[in-house]
Amino acid sequence: AGVFELQIHSFGPGPGGAPRSPYSARGPCRLFFRVCLKPGLSEEAAESPCALGAALSARGPVYTEQPEAPAPDLPLPNGLLQVPFRDAWPGTFSLIIETWREELGDQIGGPAWSLLARVTRRRRLAAGGPWAGDIQRAGAWELRFSYRARCELPAVGTACTRLCRPRSASRCGPGLRPCAPLEDECEAPPVCRAGCSLEHGFCEQPGECRCLEGWTGPLCMVPVSTSSCLGLRGPSSTTTGCLVPGPGPCDGNPCANGGSCSETPGSFECTCPRGFYGLRCEVSGVTCADGPCFNGGLCVGGADPDSAYICHCPPGFQGSNCEKRVDRCSLQPCRNGGLCLDLGHALRCRCRAGFAGPRCEHDLNDCAGRACANGGTCVEGGGAHRCSCALGFGGRDCRERADPCAARPCAHGGRCYAHFSGLVCACAPGYMGARCEFPVHPDGVSALPAAPPGLRPGDPQRYP
């Protein structure tokens, strides 16, 4: 696990570009950015959703362009855009940065958004490295930014896949301890003997296979009956409550030629070393002429039986012979009970009612963990939640100052004035009412409900 961080340094007209400002809009506006991360550099990445994650920046300061004034340094949102990633950092990725302008003028239906620029870059980047700088052009615009990927302890390494522990810590098998706050020396786990059980074995030296309590055998596949009931297979004993060992499909390692065995429901699967394949890795002496690569894999090398061949697998397949389909859903990327769909070219999450987001990470119903700012209250209902904002505030979280006059509430040319407790309409001659909705007859009498005593047409009307 870790975090991808993006820092926008500047956005403005590029060299030779139109000398216009990104703020050239009617009325006040502000900039913000959105980032999308996709794994891989292939063309297939273009078809996949933002599988590594996405983030939306804060809005920048409100800016009103001064006519005839040169474009100033552009006020940008503060802070980093951070995209947390849960699994390994892929090393190669596609980065999409959208630059948006939010126009705060008198649009009907609220502020509009305008997409100013969209840059897409394919990059290689190791986690834990320094900031990488970039300058990208999109039409007449130029975007300057830096980015990095960093692991979050206890994960370390260029892909955030190694677990970190102090060198002084005792060796504790596969469940490595996280680093102490000031001790971040890390060791790559040694490569164990081929076939050593990932679940029940571990190693301190390369090539060895040491077993956890309750397991024995050269590859730690055989359960020990005298153990204290750790991870044993078989029916429960009535006398001890412990599991009585039963035979497992990998017992005795049915995989030949150094293949490693892993259990599947009711069966087993052999992962074969290069140069061997078959159910039990029993087939050898294969060359590229024998067509050993399945599912459209490209065979390289292996011109004679003594030299190994390598299968370069197409996206979606893996294994020494490209025989295994990558089950990207096995990583359970969809949160909150979402249904994972591996479409081949892309991964999709179909979210349960009340959840949304590329990975169903947004809980639309949850008021419990939801804070509405500025005195707003969270309201659930209709399969969604929303903030009911206090007067003078708006937006999804009531963080935005709302202009009560933005919706043009005063009818028939009435003028709207913002007031600390709402709004006031100053009606045009001939109209009255809280929103100037009632025409006044020439005799001074309203055609609809009578005005309260002492209120003359044209007087400002307080709107509660």
Partner: nanobody, 127 residues
Framework: EVDLVESGGGLVQPGGSLRLSCAAS????????MVWFRQAPGQEREFVGG????????AYTDSVKGRFTFSRDNAKNTGYLQMNSLRPDDTAVYYC????????????????????WGHGTQVTVSS
């Protein structure tokens, strides 16, 4: 499952207008961002604009601002693209797309983020 059908395309002279419709069948369209992309021959599919899922706000690409407007009629499960002051470089196949994501902010400008697509309608601007 949501099915999208575009209509309203055709041949128009420069400076003319067209109104495209995107009719959605299936689930309630109001829960979805409904947006328009366009694709000219030999070009990548380009975001034009549309309305967001969570509050219906309009989003535009800068090049069409002031000429194109986006609206939706949730009662009819239909989105609209009103195109005025058309130019020859607006010639393309226009596609309607919909998705529940993102749950906040403007709609995605990236085609791969949309689960549901129409088959497109041709717009040709030529004298």
């Amino acid at each position: 499952e949501v099915d999208l059908v575009e209509s309203g395309g055709g041949l128009v002279q420069p400076g003319g207008s067209l109104r495209l419709s995107c009719a959605a069948s299936g689930r309630t369209a109001s829960r979805y961002s409904m947006v328009w992309f366009r694709q000219a021959p030999g070009q990548e599919r380009e975001f034009v604009g549309g309305n967001s899922a969570h509050d219906g706000r309009s989003a535009y690409t800068d090049s069409v601002k002031g000429r194109f407007t986006f609206s939706r009629d949730n009662a009819k499960n239909t989105g609209y693209l009103q195109m005025n002051s058309l130019r020859p470089d607006d010639t393309a196949v226009y596609y309607c797309a919909a998705d529940t994501n993102p749950p906040y902010g403007p709609p995605w400008s990236t085609p791969s983020e949309y689960e549901y697509w129409g088959h497109g309608t041709q717009v040709t601007v030529s004298s």
